[in-house]
């Protein structure tokens, strides 16, 4: 048994941590493997993941972490039964993807602008609060080609629109995503997406 | 907001036992190890004790064998229990979280040994 | 166990000047590890600097530290009123644990 791709990790730079791998042929990941990691810390101890298996020579675990500091180490150990199949190290804090952001609500009834709101989702104490910037997603289900990105590089996780950049009379759908320019990470995962009908009264137009 | 909030601190003969609590709030206190720092009149802050998440503790050499830091992540509370006592553990003992610095302190409680 | 020193242990200046604060290490200290504190009469030390240079959060831009291996320094570029304190350098490290530097007291002049 041998580790044909080693273990890749990625950290929500909160709790979890996750780390892929590709076996050389099929395997029972619960059953024939078991990752340890250890934060490098004083105080620490080691943990043992189960991994799950990812498509037939995949592997996949879930890292269950203490709360990430930017100068965190860990290592990793991924042994089959007694044998050391490999040996590597992991900073999450230069491998993250944010956490996706949450409860992306629409509101509709502010005078002819679309008010899209959601849940920044880490929590106050945590160094990627004050960090983060979204990409709001938004697109029509009747009209494949009407989709639009919008970037909001301030902080506040809320972005207005004009009902009027949009089709009125047909339904919209919006998602949001996060990254962090401080630690260079990915993007997380898109938001589940939200629906509303878009409707506003057309300018009475002058001649 | 994050929050450590002690209680504990008083005054006790040369000797005796004082047992030190800090409440954290704000945070997942399960996920985050944390420390007591002491502060004598007059002197310098010194590291004390620390626990991480799983219960491993460290203590400082001038306290060894006489102190002990618990945790109880149900109730979000961090203990010192501090046994016989000496002139030089009056200091003012400050809760802290963190990990190799320390973010976030306590009030503070102030502990006295004196005859 | 590894010794910090802090010098000087006394700095008198007026607001408006720049403070330097040494901090020397009996070993070398991984700049990770190294942090800086502020403390003020019957109040909490609080968090400047970590890593060795990345300010904490809120604390302003005046405040900046620099160094590695033994030799660390802490800088306030321009004193206000509310930086005249006692500053604590510390470390951590995997063996040894966490110790402080005795302290610079940074009063007005």
């Known amino acids: 048994m041998k580790v044909l791709q080693e273990p890749t990790c990625v950290s929500d730079y909160m709790s979890i941590s996750t780390c892929e791998w590709k076996m050389n042929g099929p395997t029972n990941c619960s059953t024939e493997l078991r990752l340890l990691y250890q934060l490098v810390f004083l105080l620490s101890e080691a943990h043992t993941c189960i991994p799950e298996n990812n498509g037939g020579a995949g592997c996949v675990c879930h890292l269950l972490m203490d709360d990430v500091v930017s100068a965190d180490n860990y290592t990793l150990d991924l042994w089959a039964g007694q044998q050391l199949l490999w040996k590597g190290s992991f900073k999450p804090s230069e491998h993250v993807k944010p956490r996706a952001p949450g409860n992306l609500t629409v509101h509709t009834n502010v005078s002819d602008t679309l008010l899209l709101t959601w849940s920044n989702p880490y929590p106050p104490d945590n160094y990627l609060y004050n960090h983060l910037t979204y990409a709001v997603n938004i697109w029509s289900e009747n009209d494949p080609a009407d989709f639009r990105i919008y970037n909001v590089t301030y902080l506040e996780p809320s972005l207005r629109i004009a009902a009027s950049t949009l089709k009125s009379g047909i339904s919209y759908r919006a998602r949001v995503r996060a990254w962090a320019q401080c630690y260079n990470t990915t993007w997380s995962e898109w938001s589940p997406s939200t629906k509303w009908h878009n409707s506003y009264r057309e300018p009475f137009e002058q001649h | 907001e994050v929050q450590l909030v002690q209680s504990g601190g008083g005054l006790v003969h040369p000797g005796g036992s004082l047992r030190l609590s800090c409440a954290g709030s704000?945070?997942?206190?399960?996920?985050?190890?944390m420390f007591w720092v002491r502060q004598a009149p007059g002197k310098g802050l010194e590291w004390v004790s620390g626990?991480?998440?799983?219960?491993?503790?460290s203590y400082a050499d001038s306290v060894k064998g006489r102190f002990t830091i618990s945790r109880d992540n149900a109730k979000n509370s961090l203990y010192l229990q501090m046994n016989s006592l000496r002139a030089e553990d009056m200091a003012v003992y400050y809760c802290?979280?963190?990990?190799?610095?320390?973010?976030?302190w306590g009030q503070g409680t102030l502990v006295t040994v004196s005859s | 166990e590894i010794v910090l020193t802090q010098s000087p242990g006394t700095l008198s200046l007026s607001p408006g000047e720049r403070a330097t604060l040494s901090c020397r290490a009996s070993q070398s200290v991984s700049s990770s590890y190294l942090a800086w504190y502020q403390q003020k009469p019957g109040q909490a030390p609080r968090l400047l600097i970590y890593?060795?240079?990345s300010r904490a959060t809120g604390i302003p831009d005046r405040f900046s530290g620099s160094g590695s291996g033994t030799d660390f320094t802490l800088t306030i570029s321009r004193l206000e009123p509310e930086d005249f304190a006692v500053y604590y350098c510390q470390q951590y490290d995997h063996s040894a644990g966490w110790t402080f530097g005795q302290g610079t007291k940074v009063e007005i002049k």
């Open positions: 704000g945070f997942t206190f399960s996920r985050n190890a």
């Open positions: 890593g060795a240079s």
């Open positions: 626990i991480g998440t799983g219960g491993a503790t």
């Open positions: 802290a979280r963190g990990r190799y610095y320390f973010p976030w």
